[in-house]
């Protein structure tokens, strides 16, 4: 038997993916475990194999369909179970009635690009990925810029309280290398959380013009 504290957390990306993490103190590393998804209103079910991500936690992605298909709505409730093999039997380790639109985490923004760069400012754009059309403008973003000699954790957060897929960074230092990241969150959902940060976009500001003698 597996003892210890269990934690089972899942998020819906608003389209066709439910990502789950199961952590269990004292769990056996070599145990084969799966997440089973049974929607209450739909005649499909889905399974994914939990793979270790750390000493006592496992993760997997339930792929419900093609990336941009709308597989669930706010009416759906999905029963999610962690099932682990014990000999020839499967044992249920965790269960939750999952409300997809109360537990949202979108995919990280993609296609970051520098639209225009100057000595002290840089205009950057991005796109959201695999987000339900349901949200329309009801999204917010956070962005951060990595300056030389600092860490991402030290970077101040810039908040965009609307669906705005661009930003103009000001007061930058000329001829300096920066990196930029952005993340997105829907306004809906009691347990909704921020998407992962986007892949960093590296850019360099233009050098200051040389003064005349």
């Amino acid at each position: 038997a597996v003892n210890g504290t269990s934690r089972f957390t899942c998020f819906y990306n608003s389209r066709a993916n439910i990502s789950c993490v199961w952590s269990q103190d004292g769990a056996l590393q070599d145990t084969s475990c799966q997440v089973h998804a049974w929607p209450d209103r739909r005649r499909w079910n889905q399974t994914c194999e939990l793979l270790p991500v750390s000493q006592a936690s496992w993760a997997c992605n339930l792929i419900l369909g093609t990336p941009d298909s709308q597989k669930l709505t706010a009416v759906d409730i999905v029963t999610l179970r962690v099932m682990c093999r014990e000999g020839v039997r499967w044992r249920m380790m965790a269960i939750q009635d999952f409300k997809p639109f109360e537990n949202l985490r979108l995919m990280a923004p993609i296609s970051l690009q520098v639209v225009h760069v100057e000595t002290h400012r840089c205009n950057i754009s991005w796109k959201i990925s695999q987000a339900s059309h349901y949200f329309e403008r009801h999204l917010e973003f956070e962005a951060r810029t990595l300056s030389p000699g600092h860490t991402w954790e030290e970077a101040p957060l810039m908040t965009l309280k609307q669906k705005q897929e661009w930003i103009c960074l000001e007061t930058l230092t000329p001829d300096t290398q920066y990196e930029f990241q952005v993340r997105v969150k829907p306004l809906q959902g009691e347990f909704t959380t921020w998407s992962p940060w986007s892949q960093p976009l590296a850019f360099r500001t233009k050098p200051a013009a040389l003064g005349k003698d």
Epitope: R41, Q70, T73, A74, V75, H138
Partner: antibody
């Protein structure tokens, strides 16, 4: 061919009760959510409630849940609507409807309806 | 509950006319569905998931929209299209219907 046939309608006095039935055929009834929807004379459609395949989940329109009860018998391929404490405003054609989905959820088949008249 | 408002409630049009029916939801919905109903008959699923035509529905029908505003369009009205059309959402419980749009012959 999917068929839904309602029965049990008729004239009933205010305060009375009536039990409507919906006989399903042409599909695996035990796998589908089902709903009751009504339509008052000359009016629009009003959802009454729904029941899931194994009867473990039954939801009602808030205004009707105290007087109406939905049930089903998968062995008989039948859906039921028990209506109590009937009022004049319950006069309507009552339809049973099957749920289906592609991405969103909708009603894909409807019965022909059964008429309930509440009058003294 | 999400309230659905259809406009117009009725319209008179001639065969060959282009007809547009609008459905406004009081809150955002993921999809809108449309049903056709003829007098004395049960409703029929007509358009689902906002823009997909049910089996047997002629291609002169189309559906569009997102958020809170949705439309059903008939590009060239035919005699068999005279009926009442209802919109319906099921993005949250309870499912709700619009009040209907009656398409009559001018």
């Amino acid at each position: 061919e999917v068929q839904l046939v309602e029965s049990g309608g008729g004239l009933v006095q205010p305060g009375g009760s009536l039990r409507l039935s919906c006989a399903a055929s042409g599909f695996d009834f035990s796998r589908y959510w089902m709903s009751w929807v009504r339509q008052a004379p000359g009016k629009g459609l009003e959802w009454i409630g729904e029941i899931n395949p194994d009867s473990s989940t039954i939801n009602y329109a808030p205004s009707l849940k105290d007087r109406f009860t939905i049930s089903r018998d998968n062995a008989k391929n039948s859906l039921y609507l028990q209506m109590n404490s009937l009022r004049a405003e319950d006069t309507a054609v009552y339809y049973c409807a099957r749920h289906d989905y592609d991405e969103g959820i909708y009603f894909d088949y409807w019965g022909q309806g059964t008429t309930v008249t509440v009058s003294s | 509950d999400i309230q659905m408002t259809q406009s117009p409630s009725s319209l008179s049009a001639s065969v060959g006319d282009r007809v547009t029916i609008t459905c406004s939801a009081s809150s955002r919905v993921i999809y809108m569905h449309w049903y056709q109903q003829k007098p004395g008959k049960a409703p029929k699923r007509w358009i689902y998931d906002t823009s997909k035509l049910a089996s047997g529905v002629p291609s002169r029908f189309s559906g569009s929209g997102s958020g809170t505003e949705f439309t059903l369009t008939i590009s060239s009205l035919q005699p068999e299209d005279f009926a009442t059309y209802y919109c319906q959402q099921w993005s949250s419980n309870p499912p709700t219907f619009g009040g209907g749009t009656k398409v009559e012959i001018k």
